[in-house]
């Protein structure tokens, strides 16, 4: 009888080890998906339409490397601009490098000329820190050139080849960004 109990205990322990392993695998999977959240979201939202359309970017979006960009044709305040982008499975533009900044400003020159376009930068009014919406800080070369004197919330925008700041409640065009879908050829 003692041997039977011992065997059952060993089986239970083995089962527990397997469950712990499964949990660890799930945790790892969850973490890796969180790291790729932007891409995961873009993939899920676009996978159905990509069955009919093999283009890496939707119609009226511009591609550069792994990103798709949409330049709005309407004005809105910063918060509404971000909401508009989110509805499209994207976010307001997050400029990662000088190369990306150059591509954006070059494209804007061709499309529309020298207007103001909201990007995904906002400034914490208490600490003065600039943050992209994923929480990262812009690289030193991509900090808005002028600090707005507004007592209100301040957000970042692109004009010509500069990154500037303004009251978030002013109306501007905006630029959305999402990951380009990889072609499955």
């Amino acid at each position: 009888k003692l041997l039977q109990v011992s065997t059952i205990a060993m089986q239970q322990q083995e089962k527990l080890i397997q469950q712990e392993r499964a949990l660890l695998n799930f945790t790892e999977w969850k973490r890796s998906c969180a790291l790729q959240m932007k891409y995961c979201q873009a993939f899920m939202q676009n996978s159905l339409s990509s069955a009919h359309n093999s283009s890496p970017c939707p119609n009226n979006w511009i591609q550069n490397r792994e990103s798709c960009y949409y330049v709005s044709e309407i004005w809105s305040i910063w918060h509404t601009s971000q909401e508009n982008c989110l509805k499209e499975g994207s976010t307001l533009l997050q400029i990662e490098s000088k190369e990306e900044m150059d591509f954006i400003t070059g494209s804007l020159r061709k499309i529309k000329g020298s207007y103001d376009y909201w990007v995904g930068l906002s400034q914490d009014g208490h600490s003065g820190r600039w943050l992209w919406q994923d929480g990262s800080s812009p690289s030193p070369g991509l900090l808005p050139a002028e600090r707005s004197q507004s007592a209100n919330q301040v957000c970042g925008y692109v004009k010509s080849n500069s990154l500037l700041s303004s009251n978030c409640s002013t109306w501007k065009y905006f630029i959305c960004e999402k990951y380009a879908l990889r072609s499955s050829v």
Partner: nanobody
């Protein structure tokens, strides 16, 4: 419209812990940096911590670094602030904030 409702404050002894929550509605919570700020009696608003839209890049003001942990659950549209090893200096009304918009706040009092 944006609505933020803070809860979880209370009276706690020095060295104790509290977890604040902030229920968000009226906007796409998962798309924005969120912050906690506080206002101590007779003082101005002070930034405490921020977290990125997907839960990355948490950052803290120096005085709470290592004691407070900011986190978020985008499925529940909720922001959290876990406060450990509380000190009398942490006594304040705590607000969660999104783009300059705040809720009504929750009072945290640290006293023996």
């Amino acid at each position: 419209q944006v609505q933020l409702v803070e809860s979880g404050g209370g009276l706690v002894q020095p060295g104790g812990s509290l977890r604040l929550s902030c229920a968000a509605s009226g906007f796409t919570f998962s798309g924005y940096v969120m912050s906690w700020v506080r206002q101590a009696p007779g003082k101005g608003l002070e930034w405490v911590a921020s977290i990125g839209s997907g839960g990355g890049y948490p950052s803290y003001t120096g005085s709470v670094e290592g004691r407070f942990t900011i986190s978020r659950d985008n499925a529940k549209n909720t922001l959290y602030l876990l406060m450990n090893n509380l000190k009398p200096d942490d006594t304040a009304v705590y607000y969660c904030e999104m783009l300059g918009r705040r809720g009504q706040g929750t009072q945290v009092t640290v006293s023996s």
